[in-house]
């Protein structure tokens, strides 16, 4: 959804609810920058390619990030 804006944050709302790592197509972590002064986490789901904004401060989401990074380190040689 292309939006013209000066502040280029992405998420209007965020969710505390964890997502099943198996149902994840992609997980993007966008660090704070001059364009957006906060960290944003965007989960793309396999089903319908739906994108969700997740709460970086939520314990459940932090656990999800740990699980995903653990999975990635297993895969990398």
């Amino acid at each position: 959804v292309p939006l013209s804006r000066t502040v280029r944050c992405t998420c209007i709302s965020i969710s505390n609810q964890p997502v099943n790592p198996r149902s994840l197509e992609k997980l993007e972590i966008i660090p704070a920058s001059q364009f957006c002064p906060r960290v944003e986490i965007i989960a793309t789901m396999k089903k319908k390619g739906e994108k969700r904004c997740l709460n970086p401060e939520s314990k459940a989401i932090k656990n999800l990030l740990k699980a995903v990074s653990k999975e990635m380190s297993k895969r990398s040689p």
């Epitope: 959804v1 292309p2 939006l3 804006r5 502040v7 944050c9 992405t10 998420c11 209007i12 709302s13 965020i14 969710s15 505390n16 609810q17 957006c36 002064p37 906060r38 965007i42 319908k48 739906e50 994108k51 969700r52 904004c53 709460n55």
Partner: antibody, heavy 123, light 107 residues
């Protein structure tokens, strides 16, 4: 359960200002993008403005840009709409609404609505 | 802005009837469409989001379908409490826009 209660409406003269409030409870307000939507008497629904969950982003309908300001106080679970330079065409019931919590980029559909507050602009 | 065109603007029906309301977007909006019900002097109530997902607590006689530009709200068996005005809304891009409404009246 989710509750949104608007207040601050009334009869005002053209050119004057008004501040509407929306007190929220029953959900995690600080995670939720919030909108104002209005409805002129006997007419359809018109989106007015949105603010993101922590107040960084605001968007407005062209018809109100420069005159309306949306803001929020997460410590008080309250949404505001400051309306300046009121015109006759601003006469409407003003609703605050929550948006579905996970929709990427907003705009979002509106999960819950308040009961509305009537603003009448008349000399 | 994306224009949303609803039809019909009003209809008369009887309890038990199957009712279909259509909504057309001026450009493709994927499945980013919601439907609302509004009764006189009341706030709108969310029925359906993402074109076909039923909002929690909404009776299963309500269903939504469509994607792209053409969408439908169906009430499989109209109940007395369903007489109201129905609005569609796109949320693919800003500004969110609503259809003009469809008033469902008692025949």
């Amino acid at each position: 359960q989710v509750q949104l209660v608007e207040s601050g409406g009334g009869v005002v003269q053209p050119g004057r200002s008004l501040r509407l409030s929306c007190a929220a409870s029953g959900f995690t307000f600080s995670n939720s993008g919030m909108h104002w939507v209005r409805q002129a008497p006997g007419k359809g629904l018109e989106w007015v403005a949105v603010i993101d969950y922590d107040g960084i982003i605001q968007y407005y309908a062209d018809s109100v840009k420069g005159r309306f300001t949306i803001s929020r106080d997460n410590s008080k679970n309250t949404l505001y709409l400051q309306i300046n330079s009121l015109r006759a065409e601003d006469t409407a019931v003003y609703y605050c609404a929550t948006e579905r919590g996970t929709h990427y980029y907003g705009s979002g559909s509106f999960d819950y609505w308040g009961q509305g507050t009537l603003v009448t602009v008349s000399s | 802005d994306i224009q949303m065109t609803q039809s019909p603007s009003s209809l008369s029906a009887s309890v038990g009837d199957r009712v279909t309301i259509t909504c057309r977007a001026s450009q493709g909006i994927s499945s980013w469409l919601a439907w609302y019900q509004q009764k006189p002097e009341k706030a709108p109530k969310s029925l359906i989001y993402a074109a076909s997902s039923l909002q929690s607590g909404v009776p299963s006689r309500f269903s939504g379908s469509g994607s792209g530009t053409d969408f439908t709200l169906t009430i499989s068996s109209l109940q007395p409490e369903d007489f109201a005005t129905y609005y569609c809304q796109q949320y693919n891009s800003y500004p969110p826009t609503f259809g003009g409404g469809t008033k469902v009246e008692i025949k």
